[in-house]
Interface confidence: medium
């Protein structure tokens, strides 16, 4: 068979057939099935769900479905010794205690094994002291406190509101500031949208609701005890003192009812400006300590959680490719949840389930994709992306040689306003072309394309008539594939209107109130947004696995490289005198970007013209496209972050969720004016420019004619 025929594509067995097979009603049923009990990582319930998914994927028609298990470090509250925070008087008596659990939602009162709110991987401890309010505990918040307000957090317990940045960054910042404990809380300003009722009457966070979450700073390491290698049966494990990314001070989350009780007594300095005020009826004083009448009272934390090596299970399904079985397109999302996982992750897992069913249906009718598709149900994502990272560590040699693309499939919705896509620039054209072919589910856009409604509601800030596509950051299972291995990656979900809803994430994120009913009643009663997300994720996988020429456009990388070079150059230009003194030049970077642009343009011309019936030439051109993302990987990694190896993108050092471009240069320049040794600091800037320029040039050369 010629390569054109090999996938047996008849009019029935094409993208349309795949998309038409996806049904909203099935996604709804799967979501219900996945959300009736908690599926916390490391528990029997989540193991049983893994086996159920394995069985169903086999029924759907995949060639093989296996469980891949690992023994990783997890963290749980002590069942007999609950975590809480108290206000104590001068005699040490507890005059106020925070709640020990969230009031369960209606219909779930008798469900067992709901883990109470806790900060996963918090060390044990019972620190007591004065409170300091640190706003969102971002880098800039601590700069404001320490440099402008001259407030010292050393030896204090800090209270920070959730939002804006990953909670692990908040804890790291507090540790660096010398705090001896951290209290995290959800402020209504960030988690209560005006005009919407609290759950169960609406999708807002009630006062007793609390956000769970891990507080690690893993920087891509995976299991804290086995960085770089799989946590298998013969693994060598580090001692807990050498574990990667564990916090050193106790941390605990609370809701806004409890936060009110702590914050209403705060004294000391007034908030520096309105951006430090939330929506509670408290002064938002920074402290330290309580005001006059209460100045002898202190805050005490009681944290008794334990870290335990526990078995986790990934489900890995394979649909073998007919022509290029050694080329892998991966669709993966996690299965473990903090409690019921109504949105995170099961709205995503239900979509993956339906995508697998649709692919299976086509396979049963005699169709196969050109390339192999791997489907993954990851475990322990909530504990630091552990399942995906351990599997990728175990299979890294295969993945780096065979991995075409990774599409992530966590929560399908975080709102119901418009599409949100984060991906490698290589996938921009794929996403644009696909969404032009899909119908918009949005009201007012009947008969219009998804591309049209998306572009209208979320326009690109740079290119008119195009939608916004964001950089990949982290905080989800694509991390190891993209940031460590350099496999082209993307993610898509439905989101809120960020302009009108300023709260962080969705209000009930990681709370007990994230239920099936939350989705079915308030977010997507018809499951039309879930269906659209299934079409986008599934459509991307279909095209990546089935198109004869990989649907990657290297010219889009050239465009963003120029944009990112301009941006980092502008940041550096804020220090003209130092740039002169230390002879800092960006010429090499701009020259490399120019070369990349020219070579990418020539490669694209060759891609239009080559003989696609010649399987050797076809494979050669596809390999150049597949390996382009890989070419941006620096084997040495970023400074102090060896598992973040992508030179163009990394998670921000100040917010794991956000992506930063040219992160090596960015970090070298960050706060450079405060460095004690400017010569050394600017030397590092120059080194990072050199690394970036070399990498861009080297990547460009992978697109040159091979001989």
């Amino acid at each position: 068979k010629s390569s054109n025929e090999a996938t047996n594509i008849t009019p029935k067995h094409n993208m349309k057939a795949f998309l038409d097979e996806l049904k909203a009603e099935n996604i709804k049923k799967f979501l219900y099935n996945f959300t009736q009990i908690p599926h916390l990582a490391g528990t029997e319930q989540n193991f049983q769900l893994a086996k159920q998914i394995q069985s169903q994927w086999k029924e759907f028609g995949l060639d093989s479905v296996e469980l891949a298990h690992y023994d990783v470090l997890l963290s749980y509250p002590n069942k007999t010794h609950p975590n809480y925070i108290s206000i104590i008087n001068e005699d040490g008596n507890e005059i106020f205690n925070t709640s020990l659990f969230e009031p369960p939602p209606p219909g779930y009162e008798n469900v067992s094994d709901i883990v109470p709110p806790f900060s996963a991987f918090s060390p044990q401890g019972m620190p007591e002291g004065d409170l300091v309010y640190v706003n969102y505990a971002r880098t800039e918040d601590f700069f404001k406190l320490e440099r402008d307000m001259k407030i010292n957090c050393s030896g204090k317990i800090v209270i920070a509101r959730y939002g804006k940045v990953f909670r692990g960054n908040k804890v790291k910042n507090a540790q660096l500031a010398g705090a001896k404990g951290v209290i995290l809380y959800s402020d209504p300003a960030d988690y209560f949208a005006p005009g919407v009722k609290s759950y169960p009457d609406g999708w807002n966070l009630p006062g007793g609701g609390v956000q769970r979450g891990n507080i690690l700073n893993l920087n891509g390491a995976g299991d804290p005890l086995t960085p770089g290698y799989p946590a298998n049966e013969y693994a060598y494990r580090r001692g807990i003192a050498e574990a990667v990314g564990l916090p050193s001070i106790p941390v605990h989350p609370i809701g806004y009812y409890d936060a009110q009780k702590l914050l209403e007594k705060m004294g000391g300095s007034a908030p520096p400006d309105s951006s430090w005020r939330g929506s509670l009826k408290v002064p938002y004083n920074v402290g330290p300590g309580f005001t006059g009448n209460f100045s002898t009272q202190k805050v005490k934390m009681h944290i008794h959680s334990t870290n335990e090596v526990t078995r986790i299970y990934n489900v890995i399904g394979t649909l073998r490719g007919a022509v290029e079985p050694d080329r892998y397109v991966i669709l993966g999302g996690h299965r473990d949840s903090w409690v019921f996982g109504g949105i995170d992750p099961q709205s995503g897992a239900a979509v993956v389930h339906e995508i697998v069913r649709s692919f299976g249906t086509l396979k049963k009718e005699g169709w196969r994709p050109r390339r192999t598709i791997l489907f993954a149900s990851w475990d322990a994502e909530e504990f630091g992306l552990l399942g995906s990272t351990e599997w990728a560590e175990e299979n890294s040699r295969l993945l780096q040689e065979r991995g075409v693309a990774y599409i992530n499939a966590d929560s399908s919705i975080e709102g119901n306003y418009t599409l949100r896509v984060d991906c490698t620039p290589l996938m921009y054209s794929l996403v644009h072309n696909l969404t032009k072919e899909l119908k918009s589910p949005d009201e007012g856009f009947e008969g219009k394309s998804l591309y049209e409604s998306w572009t209208k509601k979320s326009p690109s800030p740079e290119f008119s008539g195009m939608p916004r596509i964001s950089k990949l950051g982290s905080g989800n299972d694509f991390e190891v594939f993209f940031q460590r291995l350099g496999i082209a990656s993307g993610r898509a979900r439905y989101t809120k209107n960020w302009e009108t809803n300023k709260f962080s994430g969705y209000p009930l994120y990681h709370s007990v109130y994230e239920t099936y009913e939350l989705v079915e009643k308030f977010y997507d009663p018809m499951f039309k947004y879930h269906l659209t997300v299934a079409q986008v994720r599934g459509g991307m996988v279909f095209e990546l696995a089935n198109s004869i020429v990989l649907p990657f456009d290297c010219r889009d990388y050239a465009v963003v490289l120029r944009k990112y070079a301009d941006k980092i150059y502008s940041i550096s230009m804020k220090h003209p005198q130092e740039m002169k003194t230390y002879s800092v030049s960006f010429d090499s970077l701009f020259s490399a970007v120019k070369n990349f642009t020219e070579i990418a343009s020539k490669f694209s011309e060759r891609l239009q013209d080559f003989d696609k019936s010649n399987p050797i030439v076809l494979r050669m051109m596809n390999d150049q496209l597949m390996f382009l993302e890989r070419a941006f990987i620096d084997p040495l990694g970023l400074p102090d972050r060896p598992f973040y190896r992508h030179v163009i993108y990394a998670p921000s050092s100040h917010n794991k969720y956000a992506g930063e471009s040219f992160p090596g240069i960015y970090d070298a320049l960050f706060d450079i004016e405060s460095k004690v040794d400017p010569s050394k600091a600017w030397g590092e800037v120059k080194r990072q420019i050199y690394v970036a320029a070399f990498t861009v040039q080297a990547a460009a050369e992978t697109l040159s004619e091979v001989a």
């Epitope: 502008s570 230009m573 003209p576 005198q577 740039m579 002169k580 030049s585």
Partner: antibody, heavy 123, light 107 residues
Framework: EVQLLESGGGLVQPGGSLRLSCAAS????????MSWVRQAPGKGLEWVSG????????YYADSVKGRFTISRDNSKNTLYLQMNSLRAEDTAVYYC????????????????WGQGTLVTVSS | DIQMTQSPSSLSASVGDRVTITCRAS??????VNWYQQKPGKAPKLLIY???TLQTGVPSRFSGSGSGTDFTLTISSLQPEDFATYYC?????????FGGGTKVEIK
């Protein structure tokens, strides 16, 4: 003494070519980006072209792109400007200038200038 | 490209006067502006780089200020040898274009 000395100017017909040279002395030539700047009679300064210290990157004004080529020989401490397809509007005094930087991203100004060489394009 | 608009194009002043010349960039250029002095038949001379730093050997009566898009060259007390044409130049990004020049003449 730090010095730049241009040569190669003269009268040339439209469509003709000229090669200007700039000999540098008194400083480490290979550590500085270099530029050519011209000034038409009675007019202001117009930047023409630049080259980084290593010679790895070159830059041109739109008005000369595709016609002029800047180059350097660091072993000879010499900067060149090859001018082809000359036009009447290229008539000017051409200055060679040292950039107080190793590259064009950014430069801290042109701190050493030659005395200039006159190029006249006329039939 | 970044355009540099210099004003005024000429001015008349007396010895001892305070003279101010302004330059506006078409987009923000941090502090990457240089000022040159040119006398008839001579090559330009760098006076100020990076908006406000005096080049070695330049008298302190010359000063520069500004950042972003608006920049100023000031001569605090005009001397006879200061009658010349002054040019601003941006070196934020290529092409490093010059302003149109300001001719300072004797009143």
């Amino acid at each position: 003494e730090v010095q730049l000395l241009e040569s190669g100017g003269g009268l040339v017909q439209p469509g003709g070519s000229l090669r200007l040279s700039c000999a540098a002395s008194g400083f480490t030539f290979s550590s500085h980006a270099m530029s050519w700047v011209r000034q038409a009679p009675g007019k202001g300064l117009e930047w023409v072209s630049g080259i980084t210290a290593s010679g790895g990157s070159t830059y041109y004004a739109d008005s000369v792109k595709g016609r002029f080529t800047i180059s350097r020989d660091n072993s000879k401490n010499t900067l060149y400007l090859q001018m082809n397809s000359l036009r009447a509007e290229d008539t000017a005094v051409y200055y060679c200038a040292r950039d107080d930087s190793s590259g064009y991203y950014p430069s801290y100004g042109m701190d050493v200038w030659g005395q200039g060489t006159l190029v006249t394009v006329s039939s | 490209d970044i355009q540099m608009t210099q004003s005024p194009s000429s001015l008349s002043a007396s010895v001892g006067d305070r003279v101010t010349i302004t330059c506006r960039a078409s987009q923000s250029i941090s502090t990457f502006v240089n000022w040159y002095q040119q006398k008839p038949g001579k090559a330009p001379k760098l006076l100020i780089y990076a908006a406000s730093t005096l080049q070695t050997g330049v008298p302190s009566r010359f000063s520069g200020s500004g950042s972003g898009t608006d920049f100023t060259l000031t001569i605090s007390s005009l001397q006879p040898e200061d009658f010349a044409t002054y040019y601003c130049q941006q070196t934020y990004s290529p092409p490093p274009d010059f302003g149109g020049g300001t001719k300072v003449e004797i009143k």
